[in-house]
């Protein structure tokens, strides 16, 4: 079943700023995201922002920069102008809606560890990044090699004979033995949302700007697409018309201008999948 | 919770009307806009009439003249007159509560939806 995760962030250079990041985890493309705080969308929350996958996004104060992380998670960043922090002992709740299949919900908070008001300064989530793990391992199990071959040198010196040499074949069984736990420590310190790919992340449109339109791909949950999913027909500019053959919204009691661009009120943007499953452009 | 509850549908021959109601309730004040998607079968979802927080109404090509939505703000409802229905009109009809991008009103709830069969 889909889930959704949250996960607050205190900024460890700004105590005042703060960072909601949401994920989705689960089939099916996303069609809306909704962060709110003090509690769940429609029970009492309070929006702070509305990301839309292909439309951009619209945020409230204390919202400072809603973004797509990936096509499947987001992250917001609060601006926290109070003195007393009120951030830090508020639930903040992300709903991801796919329509119409459904809508899921989750919340969270501050970690208490976080707190500004501990004398141990914030420090971020501890994520092991599988790159650095990985130099660990591979410069701990080089050591460790060079140790024991030195080991295995100075009992050679001590030895009578000198025919005994380590064989070309056992230096080989050491060097994959002192491979193996270096590609297993990879293995199981990788952790997934470490290396997650950020090129998929669209351009924000903020309302504050609302004629600076751009292209925008598409997103669907777990169907990674690379910039060349790119769409290329442009989101226009507020308040125009949709053409006849697209069949989408004009204002009431109007006709779409027969003449100049024939300018869209549904993008039509093409990625994945058609946008007609979406806004049902024909 | 808001919570959408769409009634009204029905099988009707070619011309005919019906008109679709929503009741609403757990609205949010920030979400502001109101209106009916459909879901032909074995179609993509469209957008088919909605209504800004302003009260001005907007409407696909297809239905201009034929639908009118309304809203009773003391009744929390939400209204879908159809007439001159024709069969491409058959659908899943969905009440719906969304956010304004432009002049596209995206869909954060809705209801169970309700099914309108156009035949003869």
């Known amino acids: 079943t889909p889930e959704v995760w949250v996960q607050v962030q205190m900024e460890a250079t700004e105590l005042s700023s703060f960072t909601v990041h949401c994920g989705f985890l689960g089939p099916g493309s996303i069609s809306l995201v909704t962060v709110s705080w003090g509690g769940p969308d429609g029970a009492g929350g309070t929006k702070l922002a509305v990301l839309h996958p292909e439309l951009g996004t619209r945020q409230w104060a204390p919202a400072r920069q809603a973004r797509w992380e990936t096509q499947s998670s987001i992250s917001l960043a609060l601006e926290d102008s109070g003195a007393s922090s009120p951030f830090a002992n508020t639930t903040f709740c992300c709903k991801f809606a796919s329509f119409p299949e459904g809508s899921w919900e989750s919340c969270g908070s501050l970690p208490p560890s976080s707190d500004p008001g501990l004398s141990a300064p914030p420090t971020p989530v501890p994520i092991l990044r599988a790159d650095l793990a990985g130099i660990l391992g591979l410069s701990g199990v080089l050591l460790f090699g060079c140790g024991y071959l030195l080991h295995l040198l100075r009992r050679q010196k001590h030895r009578p004979t000198p025919r005994l040499q380590p064989s070309h074949t056992n230096s080989q069984a050491l060097t994959a033995q002192a491979w193996a736990p270096s590609q297993a420590s990879q293995a199981a310190l990788h952790d997934p949302y470490a290396t997650i790919n950020t090129s998929f992340c669209p351009a924000t449109l903020d309302t504050a700007h609302p004629n600076g339109w751009a292209s925008l791909p598409t997103h669907a949950a777990h169907q990674p697409q690379g910039p060349a999913a790119s769409a290329s027909t442009p989101i226009l500019a507020r308040g125009s018309f949709v053409s006849v053959e697209n069949g989408l919204y004009t204002q009431a009691g109007e006709r779409p201008p027969h003449t100049g661009p024939g300018l869209t009120l549904f993008p039509d943007c093409r990625g994945p999948r058609a946008v007609e499953g979406r806004f049902g452009v024909r | 919770e808001v919570q959408l509850v769409e009634s009204g549908g029905g099988l009707v021959q070619p011309g005919g009307s019906l008109r679709l109601s929503c009741a609403a309730s757990?609205?949010?004040?920030?979400?502001?806009?109101m209106g009916w998607f459909r879901q032909a079968p074995g179609k993509g979802l469209e957008g088919v009439a909605h209504i800004d927080s302003d009260g001005i109404p907007r409407y696909v090509e297809s239905v201009k003249g034929r639908f009118t939505i309304s809203r009773d703000n003391a009744k929390n409802s939400l209204y879908l007159q159809m007439n001159s229905l024709r069969a491409e009109d058959t659908a899943v009809y969905y009440c719906?509560?969304?956010?304004?991008?432009?002049?596209?009103?995206?869909?954060?709830?809705w209801g169970q939806g309700t099914m309108v069969t156009v035949s003869s």
């Open positions: 757990g609205f949010t004040s920030r979400t502001d806009c």
């Open positions: 719906v509560v969304g956010f304004k991008f432009g002049d596209y009103c995206a869909p954060n709830d």
